[in-house]
């Protein structure tokens, strides 16, 4: 014998008080699958949590974090404080990246600069707390007489066509 509740679609619940007919979820509740005997209460995004997606009868609300914080945990269950680029969050708060490391985001940890020599390359641009080093051509490519970079075309003044 088929369970009459299995016919109740998402957005409804099987109402035992009304001969197991399918009733719509009440306001501020939802059911994301069919055959539910109750609807779940919608999540409320309060305080540091902002509403990213409103609750509907078939899906829960989704929250994100107010500026200055970023989401942590499944479904953004927590908001962690941002740091500045060039810093990482430690047990003592936001701390500058140590020399030889960088962080180009407001979250996460400082990572070591790329070691260009491991790829047989030279450092073209030094690293900073906020940016990784930029590796250039290998030192052999920079020997005298070797053109490592194509020189830029001479600049022209706007409005003048070449002679």
């Amino acid at each position: 014998l088929q369970d009459p509740c299995s016919n109740c679609p998402a957005g409804t619940f099987c109402d035992n008080n009304r001969n197991q007919i399918c009733s719509p979820c009440p306001p501020n509740s939802f059911s994301s699958a069919g055959g539910q005997r109750t609807c779940d209460i919608c999540r409320q995004c309060k305080g540091v949590f902002r509403t990213r997606k409103e609750c509907s009868s078939t899906s829960n609300a989704e929250c994100d974090c107010t500026p200055g914080f970023h989401c942590l945990g499944a479904g953004c269950s927590m908001c962690e404080q941002d740091c500045k680029q060039g810093q990482e969050l430690t047990k003592k708060g936001c701390k500058d990246c140590c020399f030889g490391t960088f962080n180009d985001q407001k979250r996460g940890i400082c990572r070591p600069w790329t070691n260009c020599s491991l790829d047989g390359k030279s450092v073209l641009v030094n690293g900073t707390k906020e940016r990784d080093v930029v590796c250039g051509p290998s030192p052999a490519d920079l020997s005298p007489g070797a053109s490592s970079v194509t020189p830029p075309a001479p600049a022209r003044e706007p409005g003048h066509s070449p002679q």
């Epitope: 540091v48 942590l72 269950s77 927590m78 962690e80 404080q81 047990k91 708060g93």
Partner: nanobody, 124 residues
């Protein structure tokens, strides 16, 4: 061990003010966000306010915005709630609570330590 002890509750007339305090010990207070939560007679828990670890970011339940101010003194390991323009509907037991991770604000379900509460009664 972590301890949170609230004080400052009492009986006050509508329109009056109270300042609640929460003295914290047993953890590095300055590294954790803190909250005030209340429970009115016969009702469920209601989040009131959050403050981040450094005190520069504060958040409030809509019904208390502009009337309540959360603050903290990290040197004294103390959390405060200044309550002005009190109404009968603010009558509740007020709890302070600690968030579970450093420099992180959680939802009320995840707070890991709570005080024993202090009763605020607003009645004329």
């Amino acid at each position: 061990q972590v301890q949170l002890v609230e004080s400052g509750g009492g009986l006050v007339q509508p329109g009056g003010s109270l300042r609640l305090s929460c003295s914290a010990s047993g953890f590095t207070f300055s590294s954790y966000a803190m909250s005030w939560v209340r429970q009115a007679p016969g009702k469920g828990l209601e989040w009131v306010s959050d403050i981040n670890s450094g005190g520069e970011s504060t958040f409030y339940e809509d019904s208390v915005k502009g009337r309540f101010t959360i603050s903290r003194d990290n040197a004294k390991n103390t959390l405060y709630l200044q309550m002005n323009s009190l109404r009968a509907e603010d009558t509740a037991v007020y709890y302070c609570a600690k968030h579970p991770l450093t420099y992180t604000i959680a939802t009320m379900n995840d707070y890991d330590y709570w005080g024993q509460g202090t009763l605020v009664t607003v009645s004329g």
